[in-house]
Interface confidence: low
């Protein structure tokens, strides 16, 4: 058993049929010694008396808010949550496996630049009685600070018969060094509580591996005289790290016909312009990637040829 | 070539070669097996290789103030990785494929380190701890870790030389 926060405790249970459970001793936070009684949740049934209460926690029915009273007055509370371990593996019932980039991916994170700011998100089908708490650090044995905001519901989607809820959180490394080569990974820890079930999820990554630039901005076409060619130009996204002579991007320019089946013409360039042939009804798209480290490509920025 | 006593290196040549190193490091990576990139984020994984750290002067301001600190750090790292790629971690069992880019990568690391090394002036190079990869079962994992770290190292080096070529070239 360990304390999650003041008066909230997590009981770790090996979860198998007829498991013995965990013996837990609760102590009433009071100077009083006599006449103390204990109840669970809203029930008025007295579970025991005395300053301490010993319980065998085996299942969710044994979890909940234990309250000690004296003469009708509440003295203190202890909320017990359960953390299930099945076959040596902690349960992951609350969050949905996103399966990208691999199985058992519950948290996904992205950064738009090297500033030390990043966003993580996760999915669940649970709509109520759900709370999240996020902590992060750079490294784990001698952690350096990363400050995370509150997790918020960022999207709702319908998937077949189910509703899916996306939560996200923004974090910022306290003393980020954008130009340095990371040697210690960022660790992100999410505590999830659904009713009386506790679970925790972690992710470990280097910012460089989760970089995904915003799409190029100000994508423009300039027709070349007496030619089917156009000069495409664009700019670095505002959110990308500066100076651009140091934090350079590379670009992919694509000419795509109306039909998805049509052959795509692609050009790769380090410049912020390119000359391409603009076909009728086609569109021109440009996306960006870090020039020197193969993290994710941005989403496409597109303009029609006409 | 770089010249002794704090003169500028051949920024443009260094830029071209460092960008080539980035490409080679990424093309070499698939040859070390399908390990999970996200699971490599352990503190023990990369603490034995050189890193370009915050105080090494490789940020744009540091380069403007005195690029020598950063260039020496890059030089040390290049020598370190060149030795690693020439060690039995890469030359021993299990053998690399005959067309592996690791050979080219090794040669390019040496080329860039020589481009940075001033004539008649020897920077103190980083000593490599005794390597103990006599266990071939560890070599695949070591190659993976080294190439992953090298990708990150040469990315920073390439940024340094690109910025230098754009802003510090005579």
């Amino acid at each position: 058993i360990w304390e999650l926060k003041k008066d909230v405790y997590v009981v770790e249970l090996d979860w198998y049929p007829d498991a013995p459970g965990e013996m837990v001793v609760l102590t009433c936070d009071t100077p009083e010694e006599d006449g103390i009684t204990w109840t669970l949740d809203q029930s008025s049934e007295v579970l025991g008396s005395g300053k301490t209460l010993t319980i065998q926690v085996k299942e969710f029915g044994d979890a909940g808010q234990y309250t000690c009273h004296k003469g009708g007055e509440v003295l203190s509370h202890s909320l017990l949550l359960l953390h299930k371990k099945e076959d040596g593996i902690w349960s992951t019932d609350i969050l949905k496996d996103q399966k990208e980039p691999k199985n058992k991916t519950f948290l996904r994170c992205e950064a738009k630049n090297y500033s030390g700011r990043f966003t993580c998100w996760w999915l669940t089908t649970i709509s109520t009685d759900l709370t999240f708490s996020v902590k992060s650090s750079r490294g784990s044995s001698d952690p350096q600070g990363v400050t995370c905001g509150a997790a918020t519901l960022s999207a709702e989607r319908v998937r077949g018969d189910n509703k899916e809820y996306e939560y996200s959180v923004e974090c910022q490394e306290d003393s980020a060094c954008p130009a340095a080569e990371e040697s210690l990974p960022i660790e992100v820890m999410v505590d999830a509580v659904h009713k009386l079930k506790y679970e925790n999820y972690t992710s470990s990554f280097f910012i460089r591996d989760i970089i995904k630039p915003d799409p190029p901005k100000n994508l423009q076409l300039k027709p070349l005289k007496n030619s089917r060619q156009v000069e495409v130009s664009w700019e670095y996204p505002d959110t990308w790290s500066t100076p651009h002579s140091y934090f350079s991007l590379t670009f992919c320019v694509q000419v795509q016909g109306k039909s998805k089946r049509e052959k795509k013409d692609r050009v790769f360039t380090d410049k912020t312009s390119a000359t391409v042939i603009c076909r009728k009804n086609a569109s021109i798209s440009v996306r960006a990637q870090d020039r020197y480290y193969s993290s994710s490509w941005s989403e496409w920025a597109s303009v029609p040829c006409s | 070539r770089a010249v002794p006593g704090g003169s500028s290196p051949a920024w443009t040549q260094c830029q071209q070669l460092s960008q080539k190193l980035c490409t080679l490091a990424w093309s070499a990576h698939p040859l070390v097996g399908h390990m999970d990139l996200r699971e490599e984020g352990d503190e023990e994984t990369t603490n034995d290789v050189p890193h370009i750290q915050c105080g090494d002067g490789c940020d744009p301001q540091g380069l403007r103030d005195n690029s020598q600190f950063c260039l020496q750090r890059i030089h040390q790292g290049l020598i370190f990785y060149e030795k690693l790629l020439g060690s039995d971690i890469f030359t021993g069992e299990p053998s690399l494929l005959p067309d592996s880019p690791v050979g080219q990568l090794h040669a390019s690391l040496l080329g860039l380190s020589q481009l940075l090394q001033p004539e008649g002036h020897h920077w103190e190079t980083q000593q490599i701890p005794s390597l103990s990869p006599s266990q071939p079962w560890q070599r695949l994992l070591l190659r993976f870790k080294i190439l992953r770290s090298l990708q990150a190292f040469v990315a920073v080096a390439a940024r340094v030389f690109a910025h230098g070529a754009a802003t510090l070239s005579p």
């Epitope: 076959d87 593996i89 | 069992e93 071939p136 079962w137 695949l140």
Partner: antibody
């Protein structure tokens, strides 16, 4: 199917050299490493050494000065030689392969074992 | 060398009851690279070679009954037989293949009470 079979004399005199052969079938020698492990009667298991897919060897430091492992790939055979034997070398000797060729580890297939007694 | 300490040395459990065997290596067997624990469990019956039950600390070898499970990480590992059957009487060994030389635990003899 995968098979490993140890063979060799069951009795060796003290100070002589113990020689055993492991004949394997059902898997590629290019992809799997072969190990020798022994077990004194009524005691635990002790790893002796390995011959890697490339032909190089590694031995338990406690036996290194006396052990030689070699192979004849044309016959799918591996041999173990242990010199200057004493009664303490009396054991069941097993050959085993490790599960993955390039990233070795645990032993998934074992031979039946052969008992070697060191006695004059 | 990594020393593998098994406990208990012997164990008597009633049929249908749970049997638990522990293995404590003298150093961590968790690979920082791929987060695998380089530990395997073997069962050995009299006159037979050891048989692989569990590898990478918790992965059951194909064909092994699901009453056998492995758990743990780093320097603390457990083999659990959830409901002991008569055919489970044997000596059980843990093996570390994290570092050369490979080393086994001293073995745990499992009997029926």
């Amino acid at each position: 199917q995968v098979q490993l079979q140890e063979s060799g004399p069951g009795l060796v005199k003290p100070s002589e050299t113990l020689s055993l052969t492991c004949t394997v079938s059902g898997f590629s020698l290019i992809s799997y490493n072969v190990h020798w492990i022994r077990q004194p009667p009524g005691k635990g298991l002790e790893w002796i050494g390995v011959i890697w897919t490339g032909g190089s060897t590694d031995y338990n430091p406690s036996l290194k000065s006396r052990v030689t492992i070699s192979r004849d790939t044309s016959k799918n055979q591996f041999s173990l030689k242990l010199s200057s034997v004493t009664a303490a070398d009396t054991a069941v000797y097993y050959c085993a392969r490790d599960k993955y060729g390039l990233f070795p580890g645990y032993f998934d297939y074992w031979g039946q074992g052969t008992l070697v007694t060191v006695s004059s | 060398d990594i020393v593998m300490t098994q406990s208990p040395d012997s164990l008597a459990v009633s049929l249908g009851e749970r049997a638990t065997i522990n293995c404590k290596p003298s150093q961590s067997l968790l690979s920082s690279g791929n987060r695998k624990n380089y530990l395997a469990w073997y069962q050995q019956k009299p006159g037979q070679p050891p048989k692989l039950l569990i590898y990478y600390a918790s992965t059951r070898q194909s064909g092994v009954p699901d009453r056998f499970s492995g758990s743990g990480s780093g320097t603390d590992f457990t083999l659990t037989i959830s409901s002991l059957q008569a055919e489970d009487v044997a000596v059980y060994y843990c093996l570390q293949h994290f570092n050369y030389p490979w080393t086994f635990g001293q073995g745990t003899k499992l009997e029926i009470k």
